[in-house]
């Protein structure tokens, strides 16, 4: 039995649980998902039993090997997978555990502007990047467009201070998870500050 193997998959995609064995006479191989039987294989008996019928079309064994390929992944396929190789030649079964994380492909992140202060011609505000559908394990990075890849700020919230008369700079937020990344529409501090100031003036009027 080896250490737990961590695997990553994307919704709609496929993942292969790697498994090798040098056992000559394998009596059965049993795969379970969160303690529920998933597949039982009898290499000598010639049968493969997929416990739940809906999983039949999702289960495959690449190149006729022991590894299990699971396709059409869903979010709720995330969890613990366990395989046991049973053989009369083994005193106890050979086992392997896997942890699968299934992630969604990220949609375009949304940028919101926090409360703004405008003192002495300097507009100070927070820009917050977020996913509308509350996707998990998302990392956010801010980039200043045209400044090369190394000009960035890590984190969902970016504090900006834009002084009137300064050259405007396009900013974009990148959201990423283990299977995808996505960019927000570029935002311009000058435009955000000017729009906010206009809104404030119209409210006072």
């Amino acid at each position: 039995s080896g250490p737990v193997k961590e695997l990553v998959g994307s919704v709609g995609g496929a993942v292969t649980f790697p498994l090798k064995s040098k056992v000559k006479q394998v009596d059965s191989i049993v795969w379970t998902f969160n303690t529920t039987p998933l597949v039982t294989i009898q290499p000598e008996g010639g049968t493969i039993i997929v416990t739940q019928n809906r999983n039949r079309e999702r289960v495959d064994f690449p190149d006729g090997g022991y590894s299990l390929k699971l396709s059409k992944l869903k979010k709720n396929d995330s969890g613990i997978y366990y395989v046991g190789i049973y053989s009369s030649s083994l005193q106890q079964p050979s086992t392997q555990e896997y942890v699968l994380h299934v992630y969604e492909h990220l949609s375009k992140p949304k940028v919101t502007m926090g409360l703004q202060s405008n003192k002495n011609g300097t507009c100070v505000t927070n820009l917050t990047c977020c996913m509308e559908h509350g996707e998990e394990d998302v990392i956010y990075t801010w980039k200043a467009l045209g400044q090369g890849d190394n000009q960035f700020h890590d984190g969902a919230t970016l504090s900006i201070a834009w002084r009137s008369g300064e050259k405007d700079q396009a900013l974009t937020c990148m959201a990423r998870n283990p299977v995808s990344n996505s960019f927000s529409t570029p935002v311009f501090p000058q435009k955000l500050c000017e729009d906010a100031a206009t809104d404030l003036t119209s409210l006072r009027g």
Epitope: S21, P43, E44, G46, I48, F61, G65
Partner: antibody, heavy 120, light 108 residues
């Protein structure tokens, strides 16, 4: 990639013996069963037997007992089948074929076949 | 030994047609049936194992089904390159493994 290369065609006299070879590459030869299958001209397929090169264990079709002897050499990654006391009914194409791991009775890679002709 | 019977020695079909080849086992073999394709002058090629599992790289127009004693192999939309002999084989439990007599698929 997996390849099974068989020895060339054989023309042998009745009563003689012949040994044909199957050289494997591209996979763990010792840990996969190797099968031998007979096909007479214009006929179907007949399973002769299989050998596990790791320890030389064999399983055979009773019909070929005393006719076919299966051996394997791990160091040269080759499987062999010797056919003895040949008669005209032994004239056929003989294939070696690797068993899949997941289903030992299903054969996924086949050699190109060795033609054996028994004629005086 | 288990006898595998393919009732049709020949089947004639047209490109684009759906064709079903049947195979009957003389006793219960659960789902332990494989299907092979053999083109003229070539070695057999594994298409299906354990009744319904498509081998890697096999086009999805080829499907297999059945359990017990009755098995079917279907080509959903026949292509010209599918001209071949198709064999069923039982790989149930202890050998000997046995093959059906083969069904030759001919294109009209």
């Amino acid at each position: 990639q997996v390849q099974l290369q068989q020895s060339g065609p054989e023309l042998v006299k009745p009563g003689a013996s012949v040994k044909i070879s199957c050289k494997a590459s591209g996979y763990a030869f010792s840990n996969s069963w190797m099968n031998w299958v007979k096909q007479r001209p214009g006929q179907g397929l007949e399973w002769i037997g299989r050998i596990y090169p790791g320890d030389g264990d064999t399983k055979s079709n009773g019909k070929f007992k005393g006719k076919a002897t299966l051996t394997a050499d791990k160091s040269s990654r080759a499987a062999y089948m010797q056919l003895s006391s040949l008669t005209s009914v032994d004239s056929a194409v003989y294939f070696c074929a690797r068993s899949t791991m997941i289903m030992t009775g299903a054969m996924d890679y086949w050699g190109q076949g060795t033609s054996v002709t028994v004629s005086s | 030994d288990i006898v595998m019977t393919q009732s049709h020695k020949f089947m004639s079909t047209s490109v684009g047609d759906r064709v079903i080849i049947t195979c009957k086992a003389s006793q219960d073999v659960s789902t332990a049936v494989a299907w092979y394709q053999q083109k003229p002058g070539q070695s057999p090629k594994l298409l299906i194992y354990s009744a319904s599992f498509r081998y890697t790289g096999v086009p999805d127009r080829f499907t297999g089904s059945g359990s017990g004693t009755d098995f079917t192999f279907t080509v959903s939309s026949v292509q010209a390159e599918d001209l071949a002999v198709y064999y069923c084989q039982q790989h149930y439990s202890t050998p000997p493994y046995t093959f059906g007599g083969g069904t030759k698929l001919e294109i009209k």
